[in-house]
Amino acid sequence: CTCVPPHPQTAFCNSDLVIRAKFVGTPEVNQTTLYQRYEIKMTKMYKGFQALGDAADIRFVYTPAMESVCGYFHRSHNRSEEFLIAGKLQDGLLHITTCSFVAPWNSLSLAQRRGFTKTYTVGCEECTVFPCLSIPCKLQSGTHCLWTDQLLQGSEKGFQSRHLACLPREPGLCTWQSLRSQIA
């Protein structure tokens, strides 16, 4: 199972649920669904309040029980370490895969933290991060921001990933904007 890590804004916008949580339990495999279940302790929710309704406490995260079908394997044994988890809701349960955005909170730049906390959501409705995988590539729309990190280095370590968000500049136009300047 291979997938290119998305820009964090794309991960935020395409996910039903974005939370901060600690992985606290030993994984279990459900013998009916063949999904692996990790016990988590949620510390913050950044997206998904409406989708979840009253069931606002997520206690488990689910993933396929085998690597080759994109199952997520949690390598850290540090139960106090917080992770940013962006996943999909299926039947009210949080599901993630290898392709999901799951990262130690401490590994995120301050700009990314700000993005997940308040700014990425501003770009979700109108703007699209458009991956540029090979040269030449051109904008398909004024609401697209060309993401060129992959051309230069690892996509999740690039400048645009770590410091920028694709946000509306005016109606019908989105541009890369520094998350540093978003401090209110």
Epitope: T26, P27, V29, Q31, T32, T33, L34, Y35, Q36, P64, A65, M66, E67, S68, V69, G71, F73
Partner: antibody, heavy 113, light 111 residues
Framework: QVQLVESGGGLVQPGGSLRLSCAAS????????MSWVRQAPGKGLEWVSA????????YYADSVKGRFTISRDNSKNTLYLQMNSLRAEDTAVYYC??????WGQGTLVTVSS | DIALTQPASVSGSPGQSITISCTGT?????????VSWYQQHPGKAPKLMIY???NRPSGVSNRFSGSKSGNTASLTISGLQAEDEADYYC??????????FGGGTKLTVLG
């Protein structure tokens, strides 16, 4: 009484196809994941494939991926294994198992020219 | 391509206790509490004897017990009886290969 009965085994030429069936009774079939496990003559057990209760998730051993397809019909309480591009090394007794607690008696598949 | 390592054979006299080991890695045996043990008599289907490391299905004699330490699981049979003579296989969940078996151990009851 919980019972699993395999059928569909037999002699097939290399490159040929075969479809195994496993009829289940005595339990709520859709509530259990099911597996196929094989055992070559005089050898140990080898997991082949598994499928979730709903049929929505399927897993395969590397040795059969792309050649074998596991499926189930919950309305008929039946598990299937479609085996294509068979090789001599696929020769084995194939067991159907209710996620590895209850096993059928097995059906012999022989791949030979 | 055997994933879990078991001794090829073990023997004991009636009434004795024997232990069969099953050694894996931190990715399978050591990483999860999903180790099962199966008994197989010649020409018969495997029968589940122990699941989830140490649990016995109903109908299985309490002479059979399972345990785990680190990356090694063990099956102990106490008060050995003639009908215990069979092949024994360990099996573990593994995230990469999903399900892995040991190579099997032939148990011989002497005398």
């Amino acid at each position: 009484q919980v019972q699993l009965v395999e059928s569909g085994g037999g002699l097939v030429q290399p490159g040929g196809s075969l479809r195994l069936s496993c009829a289940a009774s005595g339990f709520t079939f859709s509530s259990y994941a099911m597996s196929w496990v094989r055992q070559a003559p005089g050898k140990g057990l080898e997991w082949v494939s598994a499928i979730s209760g709903s049929g929505g998730s399927t897993y395969y051993a590397d040795s059969v991926k792309g050649r074998f397809t596991i499926s189930r019909d919950n309305s008929k309480n039946t598990l299937y294994l479609q085996m294509n591009s068979l090789r001599a090394e696929d020769t084995a007794v194939y067991y159907c198992a209710r996620f590895l607690d209850i096993w059928g008696q097995g059906t012999l598949v022989t791949v030979s020219s | 391509d055997i994933a879990l390592t078991q001794p090829a054979s073990v023997s004991g006299s009636p009434g004795q206790s024997i232990t069969i080991s099953c050694t894996g890695t931190s990715s399978d045996v050591g990483g999860y509490n999903y180790v099962s043990w199966y008994q197989q008599h010649p020409g018969k289907a495997p029968k589940l004897m122990i699941y989830d490391v140490s649990n016995r299905p109903s109908g299985v004699s309490n002479r059979f017990s399972g345990s785990k330490s680190g990356n090694t699981a063990s099956l102990t049979i106490s008060g050995l009886q003639a009908e215990d003579e069979a092949d024994y296989y360990c099996q573990s969940y593994d995230f990469v290969r999903f399900m892995v078996f040991g190579g099997g151990t032939k148990l011989t009851v002497l005398g």
